[in-house]
């Protein structure tokens, strides 16, 4: 992508596509970390083994992808969850059905300029599986305007249900458009 | 995307966005082809009718998208599955629940340099539908560093459950970022 | 992304990445609008509050994203649905089970050059939830060749089931690749 030009005058600085910040992170076994019951837990990621990489100043540190350059980024993640029979409200036995179990993924932005983390993307699903073991993915992806220094993380409702066995099932990435 | 330059000296070769390899393939009716029960079946695709296209040396041949240029590609697919009542383990009747039915999509990379196909992306979901006909999509998408000559295909757990009626329900694509 | 050049001769016009048309729209409360029972309802969107934006001549007007420049666009949307127990066929009580409830999202293109709207992407899922409240997202994303003036909208099977409470749960976007 270039501009038409008829003289070699100085051009605005654009990052060539090959030099654009980008990362694809893959799941690794999570170390259990204490956190409050209703608080979402942050996942940590593999950043340079197998299919995982960070490139062009995109940096991964302490569960965060750190944005090196302001611009519009496409951010995506898939989390595969798995569990056993869920305790969903059985309306045949109980008058007032229980709130069903659920699984939730949130891609969160933390900015130095703003004290409160911002939820960029949320995928949430009730899970009412009446038999045996269940497994299913939640996929998220969208474009956001980010600032240099913004940090991105992926939070989940229950870290113990995340399938961390395969890098192709649970992952997180971003690239400058 | 251009670099700042103050003299017309030779620049590194970058592929302008308009010339980047890209493809969007759509589902077509699959011909039943013999394959083993637990082996994932590869789908074949429409590459130039309706919404389907290949561009800028991206080539589709014999179920494979062939990568014409090394770089970072965003790869995506949606497979819509459909079936009838599934045989999921009923824990009320059986002490040891059956393994549930499941649907799986894998985007696979085959490289000349590596004998074993690599699973880039997997979406897998247990299906426990206790009544009537069911249908649901699995969506996948992520970025990968690919080499010239790498070949991509989409495999599914049961080709007979894929909805191949509509090009907007089941598709596969990739583009150089 | 630039072409190799050794002289400052006129180049083809390419849109630099920073100047490419792009938009990320987020859900807002929908005003009930009469529409036929089996007709899909179009959603309207927030285009400049919170995380929502339109950029570089991409325009949002009257439920439509209007494409300002021909090219290949990545288009995506997530719709989060929520509801109460669905009326799916109960095979234990009734011999002939009812068709299950379903949720559907369609990203539709309207072109001046073609009278009939085209379904670019469809995500459709049967919903057979036997207990209490349910919620789940449908995600779609793919690349399409669009023409200047094409209009994109998102249609859903039942507007009353769309979760319009959070901008991170239900959204729609597109960018020129």
């Amino acid at each position: 992508v270039t501009e038409e030009r008829s003289a070699p005058s100085a051009q605005p600085v654009y990052t060539p596509s090959r030099d654009k910040p980008k990362a694809h992170l893959t799941i690794m076994r999570q170390t259990p970390v204490p956190h409050l019951k209703n608080e979402l837990a942050a996942l940590h990621w593999e950043n340079n083994l197998g299919m995982a990489f960070t490139k062009n100043r995109m940096n991964y540190t302490n569960k965060f992808l750190v944005i090196p350059e302001s611009g519009d980024y496409f951010i995506y993640s898939q989390i595969t969850f798995r569990g056993t029979t869920s305790e969903c409200g059985d309306i045949s036995r109980v008058r007032r059905p229980k709130k069903p179990d659920s699984i939730t993924v949130v891609i969160t932005k933390v900015a130095d300029s703003y004290p409160e983390p911002a939820h960029l993307l949320t995928g949430t699903k009730s899970v009412c599986e009446i038999s045996s073991n269940w497994f299913q993915p939640i996929y998220l992806g969208a474009m956001f305007s980010l600032e240099e220094g913004d940090r991105l993380m992926v939070n989940v409702s229950d870290i113990s249900l995340v399938d961390y066995t395969k890098e192709d099932k649970t992952f997180f990435g971003a690239f400058l458009i | 995307v251009t670099e700042e330059r103050s003299a017309p000296s030779a620049q590194p070769v970058y592929t302008p966005s308009r010339d980047k390899p890209k493809a969007h393939l759509t589902i077509m009716r699959q011909t039943p082809v013999p394959h083993l029960k637990n082996e994932l079946a590869a789908l074949h695709w429409e590459n130039n009718l309706g919404m389907a296209f290949t561009k800028n040396r991206m080539n589709y041949t014999n179920k494979f998208l062939v990568i014409p240029e090394s770089g970072d590609y965003f790869i995506y697919s949606q497979i819509t599955f459909r079936g009838t009542t599934s045989e999921c383990g009923d824990i009320s009747r059986v002490r040891r629940p059956k393994k549930p039915d499941s649907i799986t999509v894998v985007i696979t990379k085959v490289a000349d340099s590596y004998p074993e196909p690599a699973h880039l992306l997997t979406g897998t979901k247990s299906v426990c539908e206790i009544s009537s006909n069911w249908f649901q999509p699995i969506y996948l998408g992520a970025m990968f560093s690919l080499e010239e000559g790498d070949r991509l295909m989409v495999n599914v757990s049961d080709i007979s459950l894929v909805d191949y009626t509509k090009e907007d329900k089941t598709f596969f694509g990739a583009f150089l970022i | 992304v630039t072409e190799e050049r050794s002289a400052p001769s006129a180049q083809p016009v390419y849109t630099p990445s920073r100047d490419k048309p792009k938009a990320h729209l987020t859900i807002m409360r929908q005003t009930p609008v009469p529409h036929l029972k089996n007709e899909l309802a179009a959603l309207h969107w927030e285009n400049n509050l919170g995380m929502a934006f339109t950029k570089n001549r991409m325009n949002y007007t009257n439920k439509f994203l209007v494409i300002p420049e021909s090219g290949d666009y990545f288009i995506y949307s997530q719709i989060t649905f929520r509801g109460t127990t669905s009326e799916c066929g109960d095979i234990s009580r009734v011999r002939r089970p009812k068709k299950p409830d379903s949720i559907t999202v369609v990203i539709t293109k309207v072109a001046d050059s073609y009278p009939e709207p085209a379904h670019l992407l469809t995500g459709t899922k049967s919903v057979c939830e036997i207990s209490s409240n349910w919620f789940q997202p449908i995600y779609l994303g793919a690349m399409f060749s669009l023409e200047e003036g094409d209009r994109l909208m998102v249609n859903v099977s039942d507007i009353s089931l769309v979760d319009y409470t959070k901008e991170d749960k239900t959204f729609f976007g597109a960018f020129l690749i």
Epitope: - | P32, A41, T84 | -
Partner: antibody, heavy 117, light 108 residues
């Protein structure tokens, strides 16, 4: 609830062309493929071929040279034509919905076609 | 093409008994892509089982399909009066789709 209603001539002479039509109601025609299957005392059940909403067809190789499955201009109903019939083509002809894939979960009422001089 | 042979040709049983129907393929049916149908005289066939063991919508659980490769079985655990009919198998593991010759289950 899907319903398939079929009609066409039931008595033909050898070398004539069999022509049958099937109308679908209760579901979206474009959501499925639609097939023709026949059943004769001699050969049992035999898949003839199928079609989708875009007019894409698949045929049994043993009949391919004589068969055409096509759509009405409105897309539904769909039709079967079998040329140069002989006594061996005497059978009950059914239209059916192909669902999930390559199996047939809803059938028309069937039409007995007799080929006799 | 794959040829399907069904046995026995006729099965004479009483209500409440167990029926076991066999379908043998001339070559391996890939991915267990085999279906079973039930047909009453003068009516169209009705889909019972696909994928060798998946029950179609609305089919009672006394019908069970099993098998893989070249040997497949349809079992009716306890025959009901309405189960006396002709049963056909169909393979869809390779083109063209083919059907077996049928097994008649009759009331003894």
């Amino acid at each position: 609830q899907v319903q398939l209603h079929q009609w066409g001539a039931g008595l033909l002479k050898p070398s004539e062309t069999l022509s049958l039509t099937c109308a679908v109601s209760g579901v979206s025609f474009s959501d499925y493929h639609w097939a023709w299957i026949r059943q004769s005392p001699g050969k049992g059940l035999e898949w003839i071929g199928d079609i989708n909403h875009r007019g894409r067809t698949n045929y049994n190789p043993s009949l391919k040279s004589r068969v055409t499955i096509s759509l009405d201009t409105s897309g539904n109903p769909f039709s079967l034509k079998l040329t140069s019939v002989t006594a061996a083509d005497t059978a009950v002809y059914y239209c059916a919905r192909d669902f999930p894939n390559w199996v047939f979960d809803s059938w028309g009422q069937g039409i007995l076609v007799t080929v006799s001089s | 093409e794959i040829v399907l042979s069904q046995s026995p040709g006729t099965l004479s049983l009483s209500p409440g008994e167990r029926a076991t129907l066999s379908c043998r393929a001339s070559q391996s049916v890939s991915s267990s892509f085999l279906a079973w149908y039930q047909q009453y005289p003068g009516q169209a066939p009705r889909l019972l089982i696909y994928g060798a063991s998946r029950r179609a919508t609305g089919i009672p659980d006394r019908f069970r399909g099993s098998g893989s490769g070249t040997d497949f079985t349809l079992t009716i655990s306890r025959l009901e009066p309405e189960d006396f009919a002709v049963y056909y198998c169909q393979q869809y593991g390779s083109s063209p789709l083919t059907f077996g010759g049928g097994t008649k289950v009759e009331n003894k």
